[in-house]
């Protein structure tokens, strides 16, 4: 059974992940971003289901294309280089989803834009955080 300290740690990690994803979304949505149109042509896979921490496997599998798109943006709106931002997210995701179980991610048939993709995972984080608090 999860202890209050492990629940608190999970909550803090989710809040950190949420902030990183929101920072990326804000950087992309910035009205001064001239590459937004091009960025929206890149398609991302959306999870069929995202209700548990193990479903973060679906986010982990999309970090590689996310990094590519962020490199394309080369935006001053991000405080960190894409490499470091993605590294941070990767570390949090690995800790949250755990490495004990191998979960096969299932994706929805329809692909999404980077904005839709980020919004989906932001909603996921907010939803899990709300169940923990």
């Amino acid at each position: 059974a999860p202890t209050s300290s492990s629940t608190k740690k999970t909550q803090l990690q989710l809040e950190h992940l949420l902030l990183d994803l929101q920072m990326i979304l804000n950087g992309i949505n910035n009205y001064k971003n001239p590459k937004l149109t091009r960025m929206l042509t890149f398609k991302f896979y959306m999870p069929k289901k995202a209700t548990e921490l193990k479903h973060l496997q679906c986010l982990e599998e999309e970090l590689k294309p996310l990094e590519e798109v962020l490199n394309l943006a080369q935006s001053k709106n991000f405080h960190l280089r894409p490499r470091d931002l993605i590294s941070n997210i990767n570390v949090i995701v690995l800790e949250l989803k755990g490495s004990e179980t191998t979960f096969m991610c299932e994706y929805a048939d329809e692909t999404a834009t980077i904005v839709e993709f980020l919004n989906r995972w932001i909603t996921f984080c907010q939803s899990i955080i709300s169940t923990l608090t």
Epitope: K43, K64, P82, R83, I86, S87, Y107
Partner: antibody, heavy 125, light 107 residues
Framework: QVQLVQSGPEVKKPGASVKVSCKAS????????ISWVRRAPGQGLEWMGW????????NYAQKLQGRVTMTTDTSTSTAYMELRSLRSDDTAVYYC??????????????????WGQGTLVTVSS | DIQLTQSPSTLSASVGDRVTISCRAS??????LAWYQHRPGQAPKLLIY???SLQSGVPSRFSGSGSGTDFTLTISSLQPEDFATYYC?????????FGPGTTVDIR
């Protein structure tokens, strides 16, 4: 100019291990990732895995997971690929290759623009 | 894993012919698709990346097109040195995968 020079051919027995080296020159070694690709006789190209020369981050093909280890030695600008528990179907020409895009990648771009000359590894009893 | 299929597996053509090779992915990969040429006894050579970007130094008779799951490599006028095996590769998601290859031989 960019060069990737690989170690010479190897003949190994089933169950043994092989370690292929790949010495890079002509560019900043730590700014690019290295992929390993092989081609078995009569087969197509098979992606084996990738290593970041910047931070040692690796990604391996699922079918080789547990048998393959990729490493780098930044002091000598050399990449290594070790394959263990060799089987006869591991007989192939092994290539090291450099990423097209550079420094900013955590995951590697995946596009390969420079290749080593290839190392033939023969697994036979 | 993302699977790639190529067609045809073998193609017989003559010098000067226009040649088209298809590559289909099991899931959307655009624009993360590359094309390589592999001649016997040599290392593979990058021709096209990002589905349609011509690699520096590659002749303009080579071109790439497509998006989503369907991609095409076109050689507008086949030259003697173009007889080789051609592979598509997706680099969208790990593990990166190659297609089975299309061998272009002399008719």
């Amino acid at each position: 100019q960019v060069q990737l020079v690989q170690s010479g051919p190897e003949v190994k027995k089933p169950g043994a291990s092989v370690k292929v080296s790949c010495k890079a020159s002509g560019y900043t070694f730590t700014s690019y990732g290295i992929s390993w690709v092989r081609r078995a006789p009569g087969q197509g190209l098979e992606w084996m895995g990738w290593i970041s020369a910047y931070n040692g981050n690796t990604n391996y093909a699922q079918k080789l997971q547990g048998r393959v280890t990729m490493t780098t030695d930044t002091s000598t600008s050399t990449a290594y690929m070790e394959l263990r528990s060799l089987r006869s179907d591991d007989t192939a020409v092994y290539y090291c290759a450099r990423d097209l895009q550079s420094p900013t990648y955590y995951y590697g771009s995946g596009v390969i623009d420079y290749w080593g000359q290839g190392t033939l590894v023969t697994v036979s009893s | 894993d993302i699977q790639l299929t190529q067609s045809p597996s073998t193609l017989s053509a003559s010098v000067g012919d226009r040649v088209t090779i298809s590559c289909r992915a099991s899931r959307a990969v655009s624009p993360w698709l590359a094309w390589y040429q592999h001649r016997p006894g040599q290392a593979p050579k990058l021709l096209i990346y990002a589905a349609s970007s011509l690699q520096s130094g590659v002749p303009s008779r080579f071109s790439g097109s497509g998006s989503g799951t369907d991609f095409t490599l076109t050689i507008s006028s086949l030259q003697p040195e173009d007889f080789a095996t051609y592979y598509c590769q997706q680099y969208r998601s790990y593990p990166f995968t190659f297609g089975p290859g299309t061998t272009v031989d002399i008719r």
